[in-house]
């Protein structure tokens, strides 16, 4: 009972929910649910029955493998999906798939909070702005990543002449996509004309 698998997919894609093992032989009934008690489809040795749900018209069951195909998934489809099999012996078996649907991240905008020339050193504060997303940030100076401790939405650092970079890139990513935004400076410490 309760084999739980996690799946992360990009919104708008087509998804196959299936289990890694083969189905019990000659099972009597097979049901897919999303959340507790909301049935999507049931197969009962004669036919598949698709129930009224937000998935109607977007799902297809393969009774052979038990796979459930969902087209054009959206963030609202985030849920734990349950496949329940009723065996010929009367026993039941369940598998659970936790589906996370994420939107592709938007292209970030780099905002220059502060640039200041300080005795040949350059104080830099850049922020990487994207609308309310839970994402990972990676900053690069001329394609070289900054240290891990500087990896958040704001890059604040003091650069010495030997490690000046001309361009600074913020890469935002989630588990399904990533996008970059770049800003370039004129040495030693002024914003380049775009």
């Amino acid at each position: 009972q309760g084999h739980l698998v996690h799946m992360t997919v990009v919104s708008g894609s087509n998804v196959t929910l299936n289990i890694s093992e083969s189905l019990p032989e000659n099972y009597k009934q097979l049901t897919w649910f999303y959340t507790f008690d909301q049935k999507i489809v049931e197969w009962d040795s004669r036919k598949s029955k698709y129930f009224e749900s937000k998935f109607k018209g977007r799902v297809r069951l393969d009774p052979q493998s038990g796979a459930l195909y969902i087209s054009k998934v959206q963030k609202e489809d985030n849920s734990t999906y349950i496949m329940r099999v009723l065996k010929k012996t009367g026993n039941e078996q369940e598998w659970k798939i936790k589906l996370q649907v994420l939107d592709p991240v938007p292209k970030p905008v780099i905002k220059i909070e502060k640039i200041e020339d300080m005795d040949d050193n350059c104080y830099l504060k850049l922020s990487c702005v994207i609308p309310g997303e839970s994402v990972n940030y990676t900053w690069y100076g001329d394609k070289r990543p900054f240290p891990k401790e500087l990896q958040n939405s704001v890059l604040e650092t003091t650069l010495m002449p030997h490690n000046y970079s001309r361009c600074y890139t913020c890469q935002v990513s989630n588990s399904v996509s990533s996008k970059n935004g770049t800003v370039c400076l004129s040495p030693p410490c002024t914003l380049a004309r775009s």
């Epitope: 049931e42 029955k49 129930f51 012996t89 009367g90 026993n91």
Partner: antibody, heavy 121, light 107 residues
Framework: QVQLVQSGAEVKKPGASVKVSCKTS????????ITWVRQAPGRGLEWMGW????????DYAQSLQGRVTMTTDTSTSTAYMELRSLRSDDTAMYYC??????????????WGQGTLVTVSS | DIQMTQSPSSVSASVGDRVTITCRAS??????LAWHQQKPGKAPKVLIY???SLHSGVPSRFSGSGSGTEFTLTISSLQPEDFATYYC?????????FGQGTKLEIK
């Protein structure tokens, strides 16, 4: 949460009919069957029959065949059990219960609170 | 029809006791068996289906075992709220049939 709420108590005369309702909520109604079970005063449980909320398929106990009809109304997520030609030995508490599958599995996972039907002249 | 026979018909026990109720089917039913609990004046509630699967929300002190024709329901440590009548029910074939019930009383 899953709920099955039955109609109120009925007193009927012998020969009359009774129709008991079972209004459900909290789940995909058409995805399950509804089973009816009765219990005469001080007695055990007796399976009466089953109806699929998906397509209206039914199976009735042989002893009630011809006197009982089980139906569903998907628009209101309600199941009905009608018993005709009532006799005094039909006096019982009548329960609806949800079958875990749309084709009967015989596993009833939620029960209604019961409807007392009294048949008396 | 498949006959279901429970034993004992009634049993007296104390809080904390371990209690076992047996159910015998007149023919093999694999694991197609459920156990229901009924308190006076209340509707039955399912405890176990498929002979040994605990229904959601049912305390783990209840357990079921068996297959074929012999089945048992065990309550590992009786609680005050467990005093009730217990019914086994076969789900193998129409008509589904119940045992006659086992009344569990306070000693």
């Amino acid at each position: 949460q899953v709920q099955l709420v039955q109609s109120g108590a009925e007193v009927k005369k012998p020969g009359a009919s009774v129709k008991v309702s079972c209004k459900t909520s909290g789940y995909t109604f058409a995805g399950y069957g509804i089973t009816w079970v009765r219990q005469a005063p001080g007695r055990g449980l007796e399976w009466m029959g089953w109806v699929s909320a998906y397509n209206g398929d039914t199976d009735y106990a042989q002893s009630l065949q011809g006197r009982v009809t089980m139906t569903t109304d998907t628009s209101t997520s309600t199941a009905y059990m009608e018993l005709r030609s009532l006799r005094s030995d039909d006096t019982a508490m009548y329960y609806c219960a949800r079958d875990r599958y749309s084709s009967s599995s015989g596993y009833f996972d939620y029960w209604g609170q019961g409807t007392l039907v009294t048949v008396s002249s | 029809d498949i006959q279901m026979t429970q034993s004992p018909s009634s049993v007296s026990a104390s809080v904390g006791d371990r209690v076992t109720i047996t159910c015998r089917a007149s023919q093999g039913i694999s694991s197609w068996l459920a156990w229901h609990q009924q308190k006076p004046g209340k509707a039955p509630k399912v405890l176990i289906y498929a002979a040994s699967s605990l229904h959601s929300g049912v305390p783990s002190r209840f357990s079921g075992s068996g297959s074929g024709t012999e089945f048992t329901l065990t309550i590992s440590s009786l609680q005050p709220e467990d005093f009730a009548t217990y019914y086994c029910q076969q789900a193998n074939t129409f008509p589904y049939t119940f045992g006659q019930g086992t009344k569990l009383e306070i000693k």
